[in-house]
Interface confidence: low
């Protein structure tokens, strides 16, 4: 079998394969017409020449004529597929060149198709991950809100209990004071008691005022930390980047939280030691009910 026959056979096989790729047919037809025209010109020129040298020269020109229009007048492809159609029946050196060219283009096409598939597969996977991440963030946010609500309720109940207890104790204290007054009738003693009561009230107010400031400070910091998730305007790459950024942010926060918990545990231990050493001392300087609030830390 000659080189030309081999090329023809390969060409026919390729034609069958390409017929299956429907979306490229229109584009390929345009290319075929251009190539056929170029080849006919080249053949006509080759026939009119008499000497072999002249034929060779013309062949070169034909090659140029073939390549030239392809480069200049080729319409923009509507798909990823490049031009794969070889000349109809090439001769001589052109056979090898086009064969290599066709095979290379075929290899490129396969690689490109594999890349496209992998890309879409990755994209699908990343989209799923992003949805899952968003879901987890939402769920965690909801859990945190619920925990906060429960904490607030508990704190409210506790404050009410403490207020009742304080009121009851103050009532008892007042009754005791009244008995003391009746029994001792010492105005000076009464003044001292009253002064102490006012001072205790002032201390409690100061303390709760400070605590309020700390709470506000905490709220402000948390408000600054919580950023709005604006992702509507982002394209695919930016979304991927954003997801990575969010993941990193969560990772960093978790690490920071762990470090702070460890630090808090150590600090709490120290505070507890001190608190248990000075607890009664605090209660001595304030009424017991009030000390139960002020003696603990926020």
């Amino acid at each position: 079998m000659s080189d030309i026959e081999e090329v023809v056979e390969e060409y026919e096989e390729e034609e069958q394969e390409e017929a299956a790729v429907e979306e490229e047919e229109d584009w390929r037809e345009d290319e075929d017409e251009q190539e056929e025209a170029a080849e006919e010109d080249a053949e006509a020129e080759a026939e009119t020449e008499e000497t072999r040298a002249e034929e060779d020269e013309e062949e070169e020109e034909a090659k140029e004529a073939e390549d030239g229009p392809m480069e200049e007048s080729k319409p923009k492809p509507r798909s990823f597929m490049p031009n794969l159609v070889p000349p109809k029946i090439p001769d001589g050196e052109r056979v090898d060149f086009d064969d290599i060219h066709r095979k290379r283009m075929e290899k490129d096409l396969n690689e490109l198709q594999a890349l496209i598939e992998a890309h879409f597969e990755n994209r699908k996977k990343e989209e799923e991950e992003l949805v899952s991440l968003k879901d987890r963030i939402e769920r965690r946010r909801a859990e945190r809100a619920e925990q906060q609500r429960i904490r607030n309720e508990r704190e409210k109940e506790r404050q009410n209990r403490l207020a009742e207890e304080r009121a009851r104790r103050e009532e008892e204290e007042n009754r005791r004071k009244a008995e003391d007054e009746a029994r001792k009738k010492k105005a000076l003693s009464n003044m001292m008691h009253f002064g102490g009561y006012i001072q205790k009230q002032a201390q409690t107010e100061r303390k709760s005022g400070k605590r309020q400031t700390e709470r506000e400070k905490k709220k402000k910091i948390l408000a600054e930390r919580r950023k709005v998730l604006a992702i509507d305007h982002l394209n695919e790459d930016q979304l991927r980047e954003k997801a990575k950024e969010l993941w990193q942010s969560i990772y960093n926060l978790e690490a920071e939280k762990f470090d702070l918990q460890e630090k808090f545990k150590q600090q709490k231990y120290e505070i507890n030691v001190l608190r248990n050493r000075i607890n009664d001392n605090q209660k001595v300087s304030k009424t017991r009910g009030k000390a139960k609030v002020t003696g603990r830390w926020k």
């Epitope: 207890e165 607890n279 009664d280 001595v284 009424t287 603990r296």
Partner: antibody, heavy 114, light 111 residues
Framework: EVQLQQSGPELVKPGASVKMSCKAS????????MKWVKQSHGKSLEWIGD????????FYNQKFKDKATLTVDKSSSTAYMQLNSLTSEDSAVYYC???????WGQGTTLTVSS | DIVLTQSPASLAVSLGQRATISCKAS??????????MNWFQQKAGQPPKRLIY???NLESGIPARFSGRGSGTDFALNIHPVEEEDAATYYC?????????FGGGTKLEIK
């Protein structure tokens, strides 16, 4: 060194009263509340109440409100507990303690018997 | 009042083994991340001695074989390895709310 020295054992008749003492040393007496705890024979502990040595302010467990009276004498750094209308139910060891039950006296044994 | 239920009422543990005493509160003794639960050891004829405060903090001078854990309403005291001198009655006590209350006690015997 913090020490709480309690008065000796008491044997009293039902219906009578008793006053036991707890002398503090090794720390500033007015700095900490003095707590009193009851332990019946072979039983658990019960908190009776606290007294603020600074101003005599007291807090009682409701169960002992009509039974115990807590007082202090700052000049001698001594806390007192008086138990009235005694019955056999009041027979127990009574402890004084301070600084959130950190330091305890050795206990005063009270026996109510006719 | 907060009721503290200790279990078991008594237990016998071999020398070198682990002893675990449980204490359940009728309501939470936690406040602001701290559990106001203390553990005491009492030997015959002696006043109680505080071992653990705030649920898990070891009192200075107490051997490290004693440890406390828990929060809210469930607490435990662990002794490991148990030594001869640990034979005593152990009490849990809450100081979160008036009136301060104690558990019924757990008597530990060494086999």
């Amino acid at each position: 060194e913090v020490q709480l020295q309690q008065s000796g054992p008491e044997l009293v008749k039902p219906g009578a009263s008793v006053k036991m003492s707890c002398k503090a040393s090794g720390y500033t007496f007015t700095d900490y509340y003095m707590k009193w705890v009851k332990q019946s024979h072979g039983k658990s502990l019960e908190w009776i109440g606290d007294i603020n040595p600074n101003n005599g302010e007291t807090f009682y467990n409701q169960k002992f409100k009509d039974k115990a009276t807590l007082t202090v004498d700052k000049s001698s750094s001594t806390a007192y507990m008086q138990l009235n209308s005694l019955t056999s139910e009041d027979s127990a060891v009574y402890y004084c303690a301070t600084r959130v039950f950190d330091y305890w006296g050795q206990g005063t044994t009270l026996t109510v018997s006719s | 009042d907060i009721v503290l239920t200790q279990s078991p009422a008594s237990l016998a543990v071999s020398l070198g083994q682990r002893a675990t005493i449980s204490c359940k509160a009728s309501q939470s003794v936690d406040y602001d991340g701290t559990s106001y639960m203390n553990w005491f050891q009492q030997k015959a004829g002696q006043p109680p001695k505080r071992l653990i405060y705030a649920a898990s903090n070891l009192e200075s001078g107490i051997p490290a074989r004693f440890s406390g854990r828990g929060s809210g309403t469930d607490f435990a005291l662990n002794i490991h390895p148990v030594e001869e001198e640990d034979a005593a009655t152990y009490y849990c006590q809450q100081s979160n709310e008036d009136p301060y209350t104690f558990g019924g006690g757990t008597k530990l015997e060494i086999k």
